[in-house]
């Protein structure tokens, strides 16, 4: 039997077949946060458990400083969620006091960063208004995508404010991302 | 030709290749929901249609009894949308008695059992605030990520309030999973 | 080596390998919108960015008039994300004047146009109440499932106001799909 | 072309039993959900029940829960009905019928129906 | 009993126009389910008349047509004809009892 039996027949030579179980991939859950230093008019960003509970890193993944550093060119799926909570938003308070309704908002930015280029890129963006009427709220953002990334590159969350993240339980918060 | 042509260097023999329409894969559907007991302090979980309309099994991958059984072990991705739908929530009536704000919430669980374990397994949770102005209100909460499953395993889909839930469509609340 | 070396004893020889690198593959962006006609009681699609900053196609799959075109068939994951703005919601409007609190809607939908039915088929649905206080909201609505599709099939994304779209940044409002 | 032939209908004391069959051909019976329709003299049609392709999910109308069984062998091209404990309220000619569309729920073809008499 | 509402009988004089309606509720129509009609005649078993709202299968002619709005749907028959009597049934898909639902029914009189 030949190699080629299973290759269907508009397979080029030069497209590699892969185990699947070879490729990089990774979840990371949350974990309590160290408020850090971040420059000003760029979110913080999050760090993450790789290894502990629901966690892992495998086949090059891996999780160092903030970062998910892809260690293989391709197509990725990326995704994370951040679950949020707070008292009384700003927004309710003003609003009592007869001010103009000026809502806060909650938002999470999956960025890439590519050693090539001076900037990083902001891939998936999730950002809502919070104007909530009880006294206390909590809600997830979620986002997914994929995307086309480099051996090297490297991919971080960051939120808008870090005190109002959840990071009482690994199911709430996440970040994750796998080669196609 | 010899059959490691299309193998990448870095792949080992022990690591077999996959024909990819082989593999477990699962989107469950919403039906209408039939009110069972469920313990205290545990959330109830939906039941699903897993072979009308969109909602398919394949490859070994079977749902029995509001579960889906994972065949394999291996990285899935599972995922899940529930639409949830009421009238006005508590908060808003408590706000307007004067009574302190304490809002309703939403919750949808991703859960799952291992026979090896005796507690199921929290693998993703979207929670919410519900503390809505007008009479009606509905909303989605969405949730899908990757995690490592055993052979045997099973995954469910609980709820904080199953008579919430909106089962008036296939593709407003639904749940599946698939082998990487 | 035989070719089978690698492959699992329960593959059988009519299921092909796949490099994964050759799968149909896309993922775009938000583009600001035309106001088009679109019939009544039909959600307006919308149309996207194709090859510029984060979108792409590949591997035969193509964009064209608001349609992703599917060119091989198979299970797909399919994904959108639409973030929504506006102003204070006609909801609070109406609740200040005394009238009944009938919630205004933003709602997604991910929709298959099929030669085997002459209707579109809802695959996805996303849909909010918006009853906001705050003179300004945002908020996003996601996403994401796996489908059965078929040769030939096209996918759309639909809005039910395309006014309310962001679309001024290409990671806040998005669509993708590939092939698994 | 598509056909849907039923057999198995006829005369039954009330309380009493019968199974009704559909022999289909035509199309890839395995693809298609099937329903039994019934339609009592004189009156409408009233769904009964449908059951799945693979036969893996069944759905029954509030009136024949718990009575009726709709199964189907695909390696035979058949659609059954086990119809058990009859009232008089179930004579009816009953119909099968395949679905059209997934998603779309509706029936394209039917077959021409067999008689069945709940009567003492 | 059915679920959705059809008047019990239409009539009309050959060539005229004829609409039957058929009135659901939230959970059939309303959710956006499609509405399918159905041509009975006299003796005969059921046949497809239109699908997904206002499609015609082969066959059918073009004097039937069909159309959907909100929670209810309507079947028009226009230049009516002797053959066209017959017993003409809705049906779509309701999500609270998990199942197809029909209409009750209109029975068609040319005159």
């Known amino acids: 039997l030949k190699g080629q039996e299973f290759a269907p027949s508009h397979q080029q030579v030069y497209a590699p077949l892969r185990a699947d179980g070879d490729k990089p991939r990774a979840h990371l859950t949350v974990v309590r946060q160290t408020p850090t230093q971040h420059f000003k008019n760029q979110f913080p960003a999050l760090h993450w458990e790789h290894e502990l509970g629901l966690a892992f890193t495998k086949n090059r993944m891996n999780y160092t400083n903030k970062f998910l550093l892809i260690p293989e060119s391709g197509d990725y799926f990326i995704y994370s969620q951040v679950t949020f909570r707070g008292m009384t938003s700003e927004c309710s308070e003003i609003r009592q006091a007869g001010r103009p309704n000026k809502p806060d908002s909650i938002t999470v930015v999956i960025t890439k960063v590519t050693d090539s280029y001076p900037e990083p890129t902001q891939l998936l963006m999730g950002t809502k208004s919070v104007c909530e009427v009880g006294s206390n709220w909590f809600q997830p953002i979620y986002l997914g995508a994929m995307f086309s990334l480099q051996e090297g590159d490297k991919l971080m969350v960051n939120v808008s404010d870090i005190s109002l993240v959840d990071y009482t339980k690994e199911d709430k918060t996440f970040f994750g991302a796998f080669l196609l | 030709l010899k059959g490691q042509e299309f193998a990448p260097s870095h792949q080992q023999v022990y690591a077999p290749l996959r024909a990819d329409g082989d593999k477990p894969r699962a989107h469950l559907t919403v039906v209408r929901q039939t009110p069972t007991q469920h313990f205290k302090n545990q959330f109830p979980a939906l039941h699903w249609e897993h072979e009308l309309g969109l909602a398919f099994t394949k490859n070994r991958m079977n749902y029995t009894n509001k579960f889906l059984l994972i065949p394999e072990s291996g990285d899935y991705f599972i995922y899940s949308q529930v639409t949830f739908r009421g009238m006005t929530s508590e908060c808003s009536e408590i706000r307007q008695a004067g009574r302190p704000n304490k809002p309703d919430s939403i919750t949808v669980v991703i859960t799952k059992v291992t026979d090896s374990y005796p507690e199921p397994t929290q693998l993703l949770m979207g929670t919410k605030s519900v503390c809505e102005v007008g009479s009606n209100w509905f909303q989605p909460i969405y949730l899908g990520a990757m995690f490592s499953l055993q052979e045997g395993d099973k995954l469910m889909v609980n709820v904080s309030d199953i008579s919430l839930v909106d089962y008036t469509k296939e593709d407003k609340t639904f749940f599946g999973a698939f082998l990487l | 080596l035989k070719g089978q070396e690698f492959a699992p004893s329960h593959q059988q020889v009519y299921a092909p390998l796949r490099a994964d690198g050759d799968k149909p593959r896309a993922h775009l962006t938000v583009v600001r919108q035309t106001p088009t006609q679109h019939f009544k009681n039909q959600f307006p699609a919308l149309h996207w960015e194709h090859e510029l900053g984060l979108a792409f196609t590949k591997n035969r799959m193509n964009y064209t008039n608001k349609f992703l075109l599917i060119p091989e068939s198979g299970d797909y994951f399919i994904y959108s994300q639409v973030t929504f703005r506006g102003m204070t919601s006609e909801c609070s409007e109406i609740r200040q004047a005394g009238r009944p609190n009938k919630p205004d809607s933003i709602t997604v939908v991910i929709t298959k146009v099929t030669d085997s039915y002459p209707e579109p088929t809802q695959l996805l649905m996303g849909t909010k109440s918006v009853c906001e206080v705050g003179s300004n909201w945002f908020q996003p609505i996601y996403l994401g499932a796996m489908f059965s599709l078929q040769e030939g099939d096209k996918l759309m994304v639909n809005v039910s106001d395309i006014s309310l779209v962001d679309y001024t940044k290409e990671d806040k409002t998005f669509f993708g799909a590939f092939l698994l | 072309e598509v056909q849907l032939l039923e057999s198995g209908g006829g005369l039954v004391q009330p309380g009493g039993s019968l199974r009704l069959s559909c022999a289909a051909s035509g199309f890839t019976f395995s693809n298609y959900a099937m329903s039994w329709v019934r339609q009592a003299p004189g009156k409408g049609l009233q769904w009964v029940s449908v059951i799945s392709g693979r036969g893996g999910s069944t759905y029954y109308a509030d009136s024949v829960k718990g009575r009726f069984t709709i199964s189907r062998d695909n390696s035979k091209n058949t659609l059954y009905l086990q119809m058990n404990s009859l009232r008089a309220e179930d004579t009816a000619v009953y119909y099968c019928?395949?679905?059209?569309?997934?998603?779309?729920?509706?029936?394209?073809?039917w077959g021409q129906g067999t008689l069945v008499t709940v009567s003492s | 009993q059915s679920v959705l509402t059809q008047p019990p009988s239409v009539s009309g004089a050959p060539g005229q126009r004829v609409t039957i309606s058929c009135t659901g509720s939230?959970?059939?129509?309303?959710?956006?389910?499609?509405v399918h009609w159905y041509q009975q005649l006299p003796g005969t078993a059921p046949k497809l008349l239109i699908y997904g709202n206002s499609h015609r299968p082969s066959g059918v002619p073009d004097r039937f047509s069909g159309s959907k709005s909100g929670t209810s749907a309507s079947l028009a028959i226009t230049g009516l004809q002797a053959e066209d009597e017959a017993d003409y049934y809705c049906q779509s898909y309701d999500s609270s009892l998990s199942g197809y639902v029909f209409g009750t029914g209109t029975k068609v009189t040319v005159l």
């Open positions: 019928a395949k679905d059209g569309y997934s998603s779309a729920w509706y029936f394209d073809y």
């Open positions: 939230s959970s059939n129509i309303g959710a956006g389910y499609d």
